[in-house]
Interface confidence: medium
């Protein structure tokens, strides 16, 4: 078959057109999908007649044309082109095989920015380590919740790495989970080991009921022990009713004889009789991720005399269905400030949240948000994304609820919404955030930090920068320099000191002329590339009496690299016994290419030096 020539679809630094051509072949249906794949998805690959004549862009291809590409073809594409393909597959809702997903993920080397545009199930194959930091991981795992985790068998390495990363992201320490944690884990909750089942039975057992596939041995034993123990949510087996048995559906196989013998025999008989008539109980419902409000909760009328006239302590004695039936959502919204003072259980708070969700499906108004109090802990990042929080008072009130705990995904999302709403990270906001989370500033990406106005830098304390990396300090330093520019020498140094990890060489040279006596801890945080050009005299002036500390750090960067660049004679003038400088009679040639490869300067011995000197002399005479 003669193939027409094709120009590369994307410019790719010296790469031949072959990859693009192959891509056209598979994307236009020249490569047929396997029968099983086409059969499984109900989609069929397009025929190949004459489709290569005018190469279209990927987004114009039909699902049939996009289906069934083999991995070999993808490996020839640029990362950008792979991303384009992934987005098109998502837009067209093309069902992909595990192999295709794994292959695409492998080619998306950089962590993708636009997670929402990618096929949901593709995320299962991305490395969660690429999404570190509360905001990045929250976005990633919020999407994973919606993906079909069961595409991956339980033993698959991709699946095994997701759970620990998700637990770390959601801030779960130990084995105690809240209902919100379980909801946030989505299908990954089915992988939680037995110790979680033992310690968090109340919130986890109802989730395990709907897990597809059998629980492992460890989970089964823990579930059996929890059910036999008779704790919530199901209570002792001796008190179970037919509806309890219904609710337990998927866990029935793990019960074991001791438990079955404890269930009232009349209940077992009635349940067996009903389930033989209605076998639908065998299909565990998959919609357990949201708090479930059973039919009777929603439909039951409020008993007479129980209609709530106001939100008060009497409501703690209401059963869940009574709260649902007797508390008016509008009343709740107007009296939200009272909820926090009343010791509702988590289960009751779920009902109240459900009522607010029904009243405000597009997101709560700020008047309600400000008074959420502990109910804020029941909110998911998805809920919070619907909010428009503009008042600093609201932000403070909600941060107060989470005080003393690590930044949760809810808090990360709340802050993100608040800052985006304001358009920049102003001083008051930064003040508030760093008061609650000293490491907040360093959790932002360099791009996000670029929106911090210089005036806000006054709110930053040295400890707020402890965990910042050089890329973040590169962004913050120029802002700090601008903010503190009108201060005199010593005051300026005190303020700028914690930002110096982003300072260029010329600023360090200028500081060395001002007798600042920089301590060694600050010096060790300076950019290596900024320190290297400093002379011995400049470093001596910069450090003042602290220069003696160089000896203790001579093996560590940036001191080690700086020593390698200095003449040994000059180093000896410090009298510290620093070794490793350039010996006398050697000439340093800054061969940047060589240096970039080796990381050390190029040295020429005495022979070549004489030659160079002779050449210099000859050229001067000439």
């Amino acid at each position: 078959m003669a193939l027409p020539t094709a120009r590369p679809l994307l410019g790719s630094c010296g790469t031949p057109a072959l990859g693009s051509l192959l891509f056209l072949l598979f994307s236009l249906g020249w490569v047929q999908p396997s029968r099983t794949l086409a059969g499984e998805t109900g989609q069929e690959a397009a025929p190949l007649d004459g489709v290569l004549a005018n190469p279209p862009n990927i987004s114009s291809l039909s699902p049939r044309q996009l289906l069934g590409f083999p991995c070999a073809e993808v490996s020839g594409l640029s990362t950008e082109r792979v991303r384009e393909l992934a987005v098109a597959l998502a837009q067209k809702n093309v069902k992909l095989s595990t192999e295709q997903l794994r292959c695409l993920a492998h080619r998306l080397s950089e962590p993708p920015e636009d997670l929402d545009a990618l096929p949901l199930d593709l995320l299962l194959f991305l490395n969660p380590d690429a999404f570190s930091g509360p905001q990045a991981c929250t976005r990633f795992f919020s999407r994973i919740t919606k993906a079909n985790v069961d595409l991956l068998p339980r033993g698959a390495p991709e699946r095994q790495r997701l759970l620990p990363a998700a637990l770390a992201c959601w801030g779960v320490r130990g084995s105690l989970l809240s209902e919100a944690d379980v909801r946030a884990l989505g299908g990954l909750a089915c992988d939680l080991p037995g110790r979680f089942v033992a310690e968090s039975a109340e919130v986890l057992l109802p989730r395990l009921v709907s897990c597809p596939g059998p629980l492992d041995q460890d989970q089964q034993e823990a579930a059996r022990a929890a059910l036999q123990g008779g704790g919530p949510p199901y209570g002792p087996p001796s008190t179970w009713s037919v509806s309890t048995m219904d609710a337990l559906r998927g866990l029935l196989p793990v019960l074991g004889q001791p438990i079955i013998r404890s269930i009232p025999q009349g209940i077992v008989a009635a349940w067996r009789q009903r389930s033989s008539r209605d076998p639908s109980w065998r299909q565990p419902e998959r919609t357990i991720l949201r708090p479930r409000f059973r039919r009777e909760v929603e439909k039951t009328a409020c008993p007479s005399g129980k209609k709530a006239r106001e939100i008060d302590e009497s409501l703690i004695f209401y059963k869940k269905w009574e709260l649902e039936a007797c508390v008016d959502a509008a009343l709740l919204a107007t009296q939200m400030d009272r909820v926090n003072a009343i010791p509702f259980t988590y289960e009751q708070l779920d009902v109240l949240k459900h009522k607010l969700d029904e009243l405000y499906p597009q997101g709560y108004p700020e008047s309600v948000i400000q008074h959420l109090g502990y109910l804020f802990l029941k909110m998911s990042p998805e809920d919070i994304r619907k909010w428009n929080v503009t008042s600093l008072e609201t932000l403070k009130a909600l941060l107060e609820v989470n005080k003393g705990h690590e930044m949760s995904p809810q808090v990360a999302t709340l802050i993100d919404r608040f800052v985006k709403g304001r358009g920049q990270l102003d001083k008051d906001t930064l003040d508030t955030l760093t008061a609650f989370y000293p490491g907040y500033l360093c959790s932002l990406s360099p791009e996000e930090l670029s929106s911090v106005p210089p005036s806000s830098i006054w709110a930053v304390r040295p400890q707020d920068l402890d965990t910042c990396d050089p890329r973040q300090l590169d962004v913050l330093y120029p802002k700090a320099r601008l903010a503190f520019q009108n201060m005199n020498g010593s005051e300026y140094f005190v303020k700028i000191q914690s930002f110096l990890g982003g300072a260029p060489t010329e600023d360090l040279k200028a500081l060395s002329q001002q007798n600042v006596s920089m301590d060694l801890a600050t010096f060790m945080k300076l950019r290596t590339d900024a320190v290297l050009p400093l002379t011995v005299a400049e470093v001596q002036k910069l450090l003042g009496p602290h220069v003696e500390g160089l000896k203790a750090e001579e093996r560590h960067r940036p001191v080690r690299d700086w020593i390698l660049r200095q003449r040994q004679d000059d180093l000896d003038t410090l009298g510290l016994g620093l070794q490793g400088g350039i010996p006398n009679g050697y000439l340093v040639l800054d061969l940047s290419m060589q240096e970039a490869l080796s990381g050390t300067p190029c040295l020429l011995g005495p022979g070549p030096v004489l030659t160079v000197l002779a050449l210099l002399l000859a050229s001067t005479l000439a």
């Epitope: 105690l176 809240s178 109340e202 010791p343 259980t345 988590y346 289960e347 502990y374 802990l377």
Partner: nanobody, 115 residues
Framework: EVQLVESGGGSVQAGGSLRLSCTAS????????MGWYRQAPGNERELVAT???????YYVDSVKGRFTISQDNAKNTVYLQMNSLKPEDTAMYYC??????????WGQGTLVTVS
């Protein structure tokens, strides 16, 4: 590890009394609301009485005047004194803690039977 252990349940004639105890470990009562719940066969669990960290108490209407909830912070124990017991008080009684409203921790329960 946060744990609650109930004791004091048993069988009693109508009109009799029982005193339930619940001892907590793994946290202190200083910032906790404690409560007694009960669950009769085939029924949903219901709150009977609760005591706030500031000492204020609340009771469900059906036990007001008959039951008293109290706590001994030094012993990390909460009590439920039940007088004038009725057959409808028969249930499994659970102690519960709302610790900083962040988690609800339950005990294993103690059975009260009134004949």
């Amino acid at each position: 590890e946060v744990q609650l252990v109930e004791s004091g349940g048993g069988s009693v004639q109508a009109g009799g009394s029982l005193r339930l105890s619940c001892t907590a470990s793994g946290f202190t009562f200083d910032d906790s609301d404690m409560g007694w719940y009960r669950q009769a066969p085939g029924n949903e669990r219901e709150l009977v009485a609760t005591i706030r960290s500031d000492g204020s108490t609340y009771y469900v209407d059906s036990v007001k005047g008959r039951f008293t909830i109290s706590q001994d912070n030094a012993k990390n124990t909460v009590y439920l004194q039940m007088n004038s017991l009725k057959p409808e008080d028969t249930a499994m009684y659970y102690c519960a803690s709302l610790w900083l409203r962040r988690l609800v921790c339950w005990g294993q329960g103690t059975l009260v039977t009134v004949s």
